[in-house]
Interface confidence: medium
């Protein structure tokens, strides 16, 4: 039986040109994490494999950095990065757990206008 739950960073807003950390945490299970996939819509961004380490998709290698931990750092954000991101935990023996985060990338002028929502 799958007893685990995924906690995420929650929906986040970031400024164009800046960077953001996407993180998920799997709790309430003793299952072993064999691999974590990070995906945006239907695109694979990165894989963290327990044995083989990190693999960043070639098309994202300039803007995606592994970590911290099993998280993912997105850099040089553009408005086009606005969207839904998935962390997919492959575990044994439980199976697959998925977490969802929505990232909204703001134009700088908008970011200033709505400063109270900005990330330090």
């Amino acid at each position: 039986m799958m007893t685990g739950t995924i906690e995420t960073t929650g929906n986040i807003s970031a400024e164009k040109g800046g960077s953001i950390i996407l993180q998920c945490h799997l709790s309430s299970t003793t299952a072993q994490v064999t691999q974590v996939n990070w995906e945006q819509q239907d695109q694979l961004l990165a894989i963290c494999n327990a044995d083989l380490g990190w693999h960043i998709s070639p098309s994202f290698k300039d803007r995606v950095a592994p970590g911290p931990g099993l998280g993912l750092t997105l850099q040089s954000l553009t408005v086009n990065d606005t969207g839904e991101y998935f962390c997919i935990y492959h575990t044994y023996p439980d199976g697959t757990y998925t977490g969802r985060i929505f990232l909204e990338v703001l134009e700088s002028s908008v970011a200033e206008h709505g400063a109270r929502f900005q990330i330090p």
Partner: antibody, heavy 118, light 112 residues
Framework: EVQLQQSGPELVKPGASMKISCKAS????????MNWVKQSHGKNLEWIGL????????SYNQKFKGKATLTVDKSSSTAYMELLSLTSEDSAVYYC???????????WGQGTTLTVSS | DVVVTQTPLSLPVSFGDQVSISCRSS???????????LSWYLHKPGQSPQLLIY???NRFSGVPDRFSGSGSGTDFTLKISTIKPEDLGMYYC?????????FGAGTKLELK
């Protein structure tokens, strides 16, 4: 002035599909995500999903995946929601709403009433 | 999904009353950067829902100062001081921190 103008009420037969439109004016259409909300029985509000007009990216409530399809036409600043394989459970008022930065809905359409009946 | 529990479901009032509506979430609405996305809406019959409060406590433009929001983490409150006729209707809270976004079941503010 920000305005979201939705299409009129619809009466459709079970099994059919239909598309609701939401025409935006008074702001930069591609600058904000457009969201859709279902109100059943005059009370419960449920978030269906959103579309980012800038790049066409979508995010759906799992409950509505396969039921709703969101699209936009940037040239006319119009968002669309197509509802598929309709049943009586889909009878409701549907709203489009602009989501502002900070994840809140600051402007809403007037609502489109959908009645599914044979 | 994050469950948002609103209480009370019905709130009989007299004009001039002060009332509070509570909204409780099944997990914290503070994201990892310290932003909390909790908003309040009033839905009057025959109209679209209207935004009252966003970001826990910020009044939307044109909203009278008799409306105020407070709270943190999982517990949030909307206060209305000196109820007026135009305040009657359904009140909803919305959490925007976690996917999917979820609304409370609503609180009906009605005359005693």
């Amino acid at each position: 002035e920000v305005q979201l103008q939705q299409s009129g009420p619809e009466l459709v037969k079970p099994g059919a599909s239909m598309k609701i439109s939401c025409k935006a004016s008074g702001y930069s259409f591609t600058g904000y995500t457009m969201n859709w909300v279902k109100q059943s029985h005059g009370k419960n509000l449920e978030w269906i999903g959103l579309i980012n007009p800038y790049n066409g990216g979508t995010s759906y409530n799992q409950k509505f995946k396969g039921k709703a399809t969101l699209t936009v036409d940037k040239s006319s600043s119009t968002a669309y929601m197509e509802l598929l394989s309709l049943t009586s459970e889909d009878s409701a008022v549907y709203y489009c709403a602009r989501r502002n930065y900070g994840y809140y809905f600051d402007y809403w359409g007037q609502g489109t009433t959908l009645t599914v009946s044979s | 999904d994050v469950v948002v529990t609103q209480t009370p479901l019905s709130l009989p009032v007299s004009f001039g009353d002060q009332v509070s509506i509570s909204c409780r979430s099944s997990q914290s609405l503070a994201n990892s950067y310290g932003n909390t996305y909790l908003s309040w809406y009033l839905h009057k019959p025959g109209q679209s829902p209207q935004l009252l409060i966003y970001g826990i406590s910020n009044r939307f433009s044109g909203v009278p100062d008799r409306f105020s929001g407070s709270g943190s983490g999982t517990d949030f409150t909307l206060k209305i001081s000196t109820i007026k006729p135009e305040d009657l209707g359904m009140y909803y809270c919305l959490q925007g921190t976690h996917q999917p976004l979820t609304f409370g079941a609503g609180t009906k503010l009605e005359l005693k």
